[in-house]
Amino acid sequence: EKSDLRTVAPASSLNVRFDSRTMNLSWDCQENTTFSKCFLTDKKNRVVEPRLSNNECSCTFREICLHEGVTFEVHVNTSQRGFQQKLLYPNSGREGTAAQNFSCFIYNADLMNCTWARGPTAPRDVQYFLYIRNSKRRREIRCPYYIQDSGTHVGCHLDNLSGLTSRNYFLVNGTSREIGIQFFDSLLDTKKIERFNPPSNVTVRCNTTHCLVRWKQPRTYQKLSYLDFQYQLDVHRKNTQPGTENLLINVSGDLENRYNFPSSEPRAKHSVKIRAADVRILNWSSWSEAIEFGSDDG
């Protein structure tokens, strides 16, 4: 278990307990319960209250981070009396030992790298471990391949993302023989952390008056359809003076991705490259390889 739990309760206790694996807060059921409520308060005094049926003696917190420390609270009314109990959930261990600068990105549609740095006060023998839980099945994924720096895990590579959902909970635990290590946790949207590949199959065909650029949308981890993409084309005349503006053209995704532009013969040598983004986020991919068209003596 990743943290000490301290209970603040009146004499007749509800015996509140929290399982960080399932994010489930439970307590002893009381006979003739008329009202029950559970919630947590974080260090910034934000309150999270899951939905709860009267006859339930547990509640599950869906999307919470715990590394800053939280206080759980349960209120139960029965036909005879009322109960209240708090459960402190601190991030025990020495301050500054948790992994920091944590980030993840998905690339090539089915690979993910997560990286972090050793906590500034962490001892030399610290070792970190990454666990990922998806929002739907609450299934836990343990890091299969660690990236190491002098024997300490400072990153993780995953080549199977089938266990992930659109939103996932990341937990970096730490161990040491010397002192307690704090944990770090984070919720990440796969949409926001994916880096797209550039568009593929870029072609240019020209006639006497126009050039037609075609391309295919990149393969992505997220299930996206054609309207979810935005593209940028960089049409660039070769051998121009340095500092000359490139022509950047924005094109919305379509079933057939194409851009037709006027370019009459004889045409100078040009190059075109394309990049892609999720239209909602505009996190641009790298540019595709430049395709040349036209002639030097144009």
Epitope: S166, K223, L224, S225, Y226, L227, D228, L255, E256, V279, R280
Partner: antibody
Framework: QVQLVQSGAEVKKPGASVKVSCKIS????????IHWVRQTPTKGFEWMGG????????VYAQRFQGRVTMTEDTSIDTAYLTLSSLRSDDTAVYYC?????????????WGKGTMVTVSS | QAVLTQPSSVSGAPGQRVTISCTGS?????????VSWYQQLPGTAPKLLIY???KRPSGVPDRFSASKSGTSASLAITGLQADDEADYYC???????????FGGGTKVTVL
């Protein structure tokens, strides 16, 4: 240019079934997310179901579950809607469409619609 | 009963600006799911006018614009023309119904 060509109008008796087809041209059906939407003067547009790439399966609206079946024959780029146990209030224009956005589903291309009349 | 609520009709003179509202809830527009808008001319299939709340497919004139805020969305038509006379529908996704959800439609009349 992508086109969705639907089968012709149908008149059915209550309790019967109807099968409406939607032929895709100009693009491969296997790369598309086909949905079915019906329209009545009283209820307006009702989404019936369609292929959800996030679930990688055809999903149905709860109110039609058990009565509706959507199938696809990718070899001939044709999608089908079968609605069984027809009632008079199933009288509607049935449209196939392509969802161009996920999630939220923006229906970008539409067939011309198939009029299904249920009458005894 | 439509999940998204629209006014049944709006009207304006040629050249004027009209707006159509679309009110949803926390399980659809406020979830937040994207809003699309469709134009339906009499006897024809709907045509996508707006997707991703405010994006226009190619070929849709920039006289059509849309926005979304909280649990509501709106469509604006500026420089109203005779051929804008049609029914307009908003659409989103509803996480409680696990279904696409439509508005009841708004008839736009050009006076």
């Amino acid at each position: 240019q992508v086109q969705l060509v639907q089968s012709g109008a149908e008149v059915k008796k209550p309790g019967a079934s109807v099968k409406v087809s939607c032929k895709i041209s100009g693009h491969s059906l296997s790369e598309l997310s086909i949905h079915w939407v019906r329209q009545t003067p009283t209820k307006g547009f009702e989404w019936m179901g369609g292929f959800d790439p996030e679930e990688n399966e055809i999903v149905y609206a709860q109110r039609f579950q058990g009565r509706v079946t959507m199938t696809e024959d990718t070899s001939i780029d044709t999608a089908y809607l079968t609605l069984s146990s027809l009632r008079s209030d199933d009288t509607a224009v049935y449209y196939c469409s392509i969802a161009g956005s996920i999630p939220g589903w923006a229906f970008d291309y539409w067939g011309k619609g198939t009029m299904v009349t249920v009458s005894s | 009963q439509a999940v998204l609520t629209q006014p049944s009709s709006v009207s304006g003179a040629p050249g004027q600006r009209v707006t159509i509202s679309c009110t949803g809830s926390g399980s659809n527009i406020g979830a937040p799911y994207d809003v699309s808008w469709y134009q339906q001319l009499p006897g024809t299939a709907p045509k996508l006018l707006i997707y991703h709340n405010n994006k226009r497919p190619s070929g849709v004139p920039d006289r059509f614009s849309a926005s979304k805020s909280g649990t509501s969305a709106s469509l604006a038509i500026t420089g109203l023309q005779a051929d804008d006379e049609a029914d307009y529908y908003c659409q989103s996704y509803d996480s409680q119904l696990i279904s696409a959800a439509f508005g009841g439609g708004t008839k736009v009349t050009v006076l």
